[in-house]
């Protein structure tokens, strides 16, 4: 890989309510079925058109499910997986983790042990900071004019 | 991309057998996190489900019109799946098509359903005289 690709990560909890045709997702993932580099996780890999997921708006391909009605999904086998959303009734909540890439380069998941996914107050912060420090310069310069 | 090719069609006589071959030619690693199916289309005719195999081949599916007759079967390492077609009959003659998902879904499979399926293949002319 060239370059070095930073992710914010974030957490949110997702409360889906089974429809006609289920929850709408695809999964891929486990400790048998490592998706990810380093990291058994259980990752979104399709949403289908139409379904409970795609209608909710929030779950997106490539999102980590950490949990499923308060069940830990570390260290499951990939088929455990499936049918705990399978098992799971008709109102399910996720706790899933979405990356968002915020520099140029390749796209791609990063593992658990890869330290380069950024937290989003590190990004936030400067930003932040900058903006205060040029809303305070502008405000000077026109008390010149 | 996923990028799925399928090769072994071909002229046949009732009885006779083939073997039907899918392979990616683009993914790499991501194959054997795929669900994929057989799909076939006579002229004149919906697109009919023939099987279907979950990501590691332990689990597999098959239409009444072909069960004992065909096998689904696939080898990760080779980023292949394929289709063991015996005792071919002429009503077997149609256009043979692989279809992938990503993922397992985390619903109850509806494998003969068209609409899980987000990658299809060129398909390859099975004709049984």
């Known amino acids: 890989m060239n370059g070095r690709v930073d992710y914010l990560v974030t957490e949110e909890e997702i409360n889906l309510t089974r429809g006609p045709s289920g929850l709408g997702f695809n999964i891929v993932g486990g400790t048998d079925q490592q998706y990810v580099s380093n990291d058994s996780g259980i990752y979104v890999s399709r949403i289908k058109e139409n379904g409970a997921a795609a209608l909710d708006g929030r779950l997106q391909e490539g999102d980590k499910i950490l949990s499923v009605n308060g069940q830990d999904l570390k260290n499951l086998l990939h088929q455990d997986a499936v049918d705990l959303f399978r098992n799971a009734g008709y109102a399910v909540s996720l706790r899933v983790q979405h990356r968002l890439q915020v520099q140029n380069g390749p796209i791609g998941h990063r593992g658990e042990g890869d330290p380069s996914g950024i937290p989003i107050f590190m990004v936030l912060v400067p930003v932040f900071a900058l903006t205060m420090v040029a809303a305070w310069a502008f405000m000077r310069y026109r008390q010149q004019l | 991309e996923v990028q799925l090719v399928e090769s072994g069609g071909g002229l046949v006589q009732a009885g006779g057998s083939l073997r039907l071959s899918c392979a990616d030619a683009?993914?790499?690693?991501?194959?054997?996190?795929?669900?994929m199916g057989w799909f076939r289309q006579a002229p004149g005719k919906e697109r009919e489900f023939v099987a279907h195999?979950?990501?590691?081949?332990?689990?597999?599916y098959y239409a009444d019109s072909v069960k004992g007759r065909f096998t689904i079967s696939r080898d990760n390492a080779k980023n292949t799946m394929y289709l063991q077609m015996n005792s071919l009959k002429p009503e077997d003659t149609a256009v043979y098509y692989c279809?992938?998902?990503?993922?397992?879904?985390?619903?109850?499979?509806?494998?003969?359903?068209?609409?899980?399926?987000?990658?299809w293949g060129q398909g390859t002319q099975v004709t049984v005289s």
């Open positions: 195999i979950n990501w590691d081949g332990s689990n597999t």
């Open positions: 279809a992938a998902a990503i993922g397992s879904t985390v619903d109850s499979y509806r494998h003969s359903d068209p609409l899980e399926y987000d990658y």
């Open positions: 683009a993914s790499g690693r991501t194959f054997s996190t795929y669900t």
